[in-house]
Interface confidence: low
Amino acid sequence: QPDAINAPVTCCYNFTNRKISVQRLASYRRITSSKCPKEAVIFKTIVAKEICADPKQKWVQDSMDHLDKQTQTPKT
């Protein structure tokens, strides 16, 4: 069941084919639910758009690394 009361489980069914510039990214979440077909990363852009990405791709790992190193802690 969801971990929060009435919280939906967010899943990614397809990944973006395009590399996204880190300057456009605000934050990320790493989705690991067994209720989802794929392990995924959801990037949130500076204009609040959410994009599904493949955590096995190097640009995705580099982008997460970049966001980790930022001192601020934006809420997704």
Epitope: P2, A7, T10, Y28, R30, T32, S34, E39, T71, T73
Partner: antibody, heavy 115, light 111 residues
């Protein structure tokens, strides 16, 4: 639900393998956390859900501890060169919908290292 | 390493009272990935709060999590005898070096 097994009394320098069994056919990420008697919690390692089986270890656990997925419902923790400092209750825990917290824990299994 | 400093180590309060537990991270916790767990003797920990302030399923609403960055707080109001337990904070930091850090624990005694 989750259940650990394999805890035992072993001598220093010995090896031991613990098993975590999940009741469902699939699970989220499974992590191992230990707790020495009367002490706090200490993260050891995690293994990814799905077919990728990505593994993540605490820096102190690398090399001596190995986490593996042995079936669709079981995850093991292999421990080598055990010392008295490894005496603890070992818990397996399932992550939530994100990787960052543990929403379900097993009851734990006790490992005692003593000569 | 991600080090979580939890205070106080022990606190006592009366039924109906309020307890506040603080947790300070050695580095900023990304996306406020802070959780709080309750543990009773002989039992495994139980998730109370995740992502700093989200209440886990089945957890009573008198538990409240707050904070961001490096400073986080668990507040237990309208204290009940069943709340007597040890509470742990736990932070998660970074993709490149996945790491969980647990606080040292706070024992809550209900009078």
């Amino acid at each position: 639900s989750l259940e650990e097994s394999g805890g035992d009394l072993v001598k220093p320098g010995a090896s031991l393998t613990l098993t975590c069994t999940a009741s469902e056919l699939d699970f989220y990420w499974i992590c191992w956390v230990r707790q020495a008697p009367g002490k706090g919690l200490e993260w050891i390692a995690c293994i990814g859900a799905g077919s990728s089986g990505s593994t993540y270890y605490a820096s102190w656990a690398k090399g001596r501890f190995t986490v593996s997925k042995t079936s669709s419902t079981t995850v093991t923790l292999q421990m080598t060169s055990l010392t008295a400092a490894d005496t603890a209750t070992y818990f397996c825990a399932r992550t939530g919908t994100e990787f960052t917290y543990y929403s379900l824990w097993g009851p734990g299994t006790l490992v005692t290292v003593s000569s | 390493a991600l080090v979580m400093t939890q205070t106080p180590s022990s606190v006592s309060a009366a039924v109906g009272g309020t307890v506040t537990i603080n947790c300070q991270a050695s580095q900023s916790v990304y996306n406020n990935n802070m959780a709080w767990y309750q543990q009773k003797p002989g039992q495994p920990p139980k998730l109370l709060i995740y992502t700093a302030s989200s209440l886990a399923s089945g957890v009573p609403s008198h538990f409240r999590g707050s904070g961001s960055g490096t400073q986080f707080t668990l507040t237990i109001s309208d204290l009940e005898s069943d709340d007597a337990a040890t509470y742990y904070c736990a932070g998660y930091k970074s993709y490149s070096n996945d790491e969980y850090g647990f606080g040292g624990g706070t024992e809550v005694v209900v009078k």
